[in-house]
């Protein structure tokens, strides 16, 4: 048996790459990152690794914009090989491709510890709100590749990783306020092995490395000739990027768990979360910080700050991996949610096809793990318990009837949130 690769391809940031194709990733707000090489592997996954630069044996090595590694002047490529890239114009100033600069006044609610980092890449200006690390010195200095000031001697995190590190595109570009946060750190990919990889499609624009996440949030905004405004929403002094969700914080009530707001370009849309009518246990309990009641599980020894124990249990209940795949074409969305179980060893795939908000088709398939491993596009999104899965399937049965006769926009997305197990507050389940 053989997988024919002529039709296999990788999707990365909405672009198709053939198997074996190599490229530099386009990471906002930096533009093309020449110090990272990506390759489309045979199974449709994208593997990216940092370029290792050889030691240069000359006194004044030269940096060339489209090359990662510094070169000695005598080994420079001829001038006619020069890569010509479009420059950008912003606020009356012309910037060259790859040039970084700071902009003012783009984000109305910029926090004091944030700055606006912009870059010119292929004629487009990409700007992001960057949260700067706390400074521990009295006289910070400016550095060329960041809008944040740093203490002298501190190297910017920038793209530094240990040599040759392979990094992955997060399954969710979790900015600080994302509702979709899974408090279980999933393994880098479904496949066994030490390499973290980009699993196929559903790529989010602006892949940030894990170390980059630690230095603060970057909210991507694109500025082109059509719109000079930031595609962000501001709620309660916090900035959210398009597509991000959060619970509103109302002065009189605090955080309202039963309302979920989503940033749609620049306006926020909020809706009430509907809890299941029935639970798989007799006495569901209300927990601080959660909208819906949950079924109490047997007490588990908790790891510090987590409700998962080291065997993959959550509040005493075994957890199972949940995968998701979303495919959109011609106004039709096919959403697949898959649960992997050990007993029996299988993957249950729930397939939803929605056109213009109306459910066209819904069915469930039970396939072997081996068959599932052949499938592209599925991303591990969280781990869940059997009781949460039961709530999900009951809710699914209800909305599959409801959404076949009326328009449903976010019902399935909201239902999927049932599967996310949140870190328990104050250490109780």
């Amino acid at each position: 048996e053989q997988v024919k690769h002529s039709e296999t391809y990788c999707m990365f940031q909405d672009k198709k790459y053939r198997v074996g194709e190599r490229w530099h990733p386009y990471l906002e707000p930096y533009g093309l990152v020449y110090c990272v090489n990506c390759i489309c592997s045979e199974n449709g996954n994208v593997l990216c690794s940092r370029v290792r630069c050889p030691n240069v044996h000359c006194l004044s090595p030269v940096h060339i914009p489209h090359l990662c590694c510094p070169r000695c002047p005598d080994s420079l490529p001829p001038v006619n090989n020069k890569v010509t890239s479009k420059s950008c114009e912003y606020n009356g100033t012309t910037y060259q491709h790859g040039e970084l600069f700071v902009a003012e006044g783009l984000f109305q609610n910029r926090q004091p510890n944030q700055c606006t980092q912009c870059s010119c890449s292929e004629g487009n200006v990409y700007c992001g709100l960057k949260t700067c690390p706390k400074l521990t010195c009295a006289f910070p200095v400016s550095v060329p590749d960041s809008c944040c000031r740093v203490c002298r001697g501190d190297g910017e995190l920038s793209w530094e990783h240990s040599d040759g590190d392979i990094f992955r595109q997060p399954a969710n570009r979790e900015a600080r306020h994302s509702y979709h946060r899974s408090h279980y750190d999933p393994p880098p990919s479904r496949q066994a092995g030490g390499l973290s990889r980009f699993p196929g499609a559903r790529s989010h624009r602006g892949a940030l490395m894990d170390s980059q996440q630690a230095s603060g949030t970057i909210v991507q905004i694109v500025i082109n000739n059509k719109h000079k405004h930031g595609q962000v929403c501001v709620s309660n002094g916090k900035t959210y990027s398009h597509g991000e969700s959060w619970h509103p914080n109302l002065r009189a009530f605090g955080i309202v768990e039963c309302v979920l707001c989503t940033c749609n370009v620049t306006k926020q849309e909020c809706k009430k979360i509907h809890c299941p009518n029935r639970y798989p246990c007799k006495y569901p309990q209300k927990i601080d910080g959660k909208c819906c009641k949950v079924c109490p599980g047997k007490k588990a020894k908790e790891l510090p700050g987590q409700s998962f124990d080291n065997k993959g249990y959550f509040c005493g209940e075994e957890t199972m991996p949940v995968y998701e795949s979303v495919f959109m074409e011609d106004g039709e969305t096919t959403r697949k949610i898959a649960l992997e179980t050990e007993r029996p060893p299988q993957v249950e795939v729930h397939v939803w096809t929605i056109r213009k908000g109306i459910l066209q088709h819904f069915h469930i398939e039970k396939i072997s793990k081996r068959m599932f491993e052949e499938l592209p596009h599925f991303k591990l999104v969280t781990r869940t318990t059997l009781s949460q899965w039961k709530i999900f399937t009951e809710g699914e049965a209800q909305i599959s009837q409801m959404c076949s006769s009326r328009v449903c926009r976010t019902e399935l997305e909201d239902l999927v949130k049932v599967l996310y197990l949140e870190r328990s507050e104050k250490g109780h389940c």
Epitope: V3, T8, P345, H363, E365, S368, M371, E374, H377
Partner: antibody
Framework: EVQLVESGGGLVQPKGSLKLSCAAS????????MHWVRQAPGKGLEWVAR??????????YYADSVKDRFTISRDDSQSMLYLQMNNLKTEDTAMYYC?????????????WGQGTLVTVSA | DIQMTQSPASLSASVGETVTITCRAS??????LAWYQQKQGKSPQLLVY???TLAEGVPSRFSGSGSGTQFSLKINSLQPEDFGSYYC?????????FGAGTKLELK
Amino acid sequence: EVQLVESGGGLVQPKGSLKLSCAASGFTFNTYAMHWVRQAPGKGLEWVARIRSKSSNYATYYADSVKDRFTISRDDSQSMLYLQMNNLKTEDTAMYYCVRDGGYYEAWFAYWGQGTLVTVSA
Amino acid sequence: DIQMTQSPASLSASVGETVTITCRASENIYSYLAWYQQKQGKSPQLLVYHAKTLAEGVPSRFSGSGSGTQFSLKINSLQPEDFGSYYCQHHYGTPPTFGAGTKLELK
């Protein structure tokens, strides 16, 4: 009603080529994985090739006996499945069935066409 | 590849009798097994999938059982239209392979 109608079979010489077609109707063709299964005269069934749907990158899979010689493809806009057979051998002589998967990923064969006969002979 | 071994290769039975055909997999395929019926000069038809789930329109006299490596198809009270060849097939992974078949003939 699900219908699969194969065509394109016939007599061909060894090392020759042939392209089989299958016209599908009665179901949402673009969402299902499709297969070709063959049966040599008086013999058992042998799976030949599979093509997944667009949402699975049109991934293709082949039996060892046909790899590098046969190519499975599909045209969702026309609800058509194809099997391009090159460098044919006498052992490729068989009835070729166009088959619809039981689901998106199942790999059990829910619906079969009536078959088209391919004879490879000098 | 997973090998599927079917037995018996052929069997004779009379209308009204009960027959059992068995299928063995070369490795654990859990419940990922399908059964097909093929009448002379016709295309195969799905009878059972996931070892024991009856396909739409299949009479209840057919039943599938087993898991792991050992499976069987039982036909209660044979009817004249039940005579023909029967094939098992695993749907555990790629490539899906078939058993060599069992020819059920009228005694």
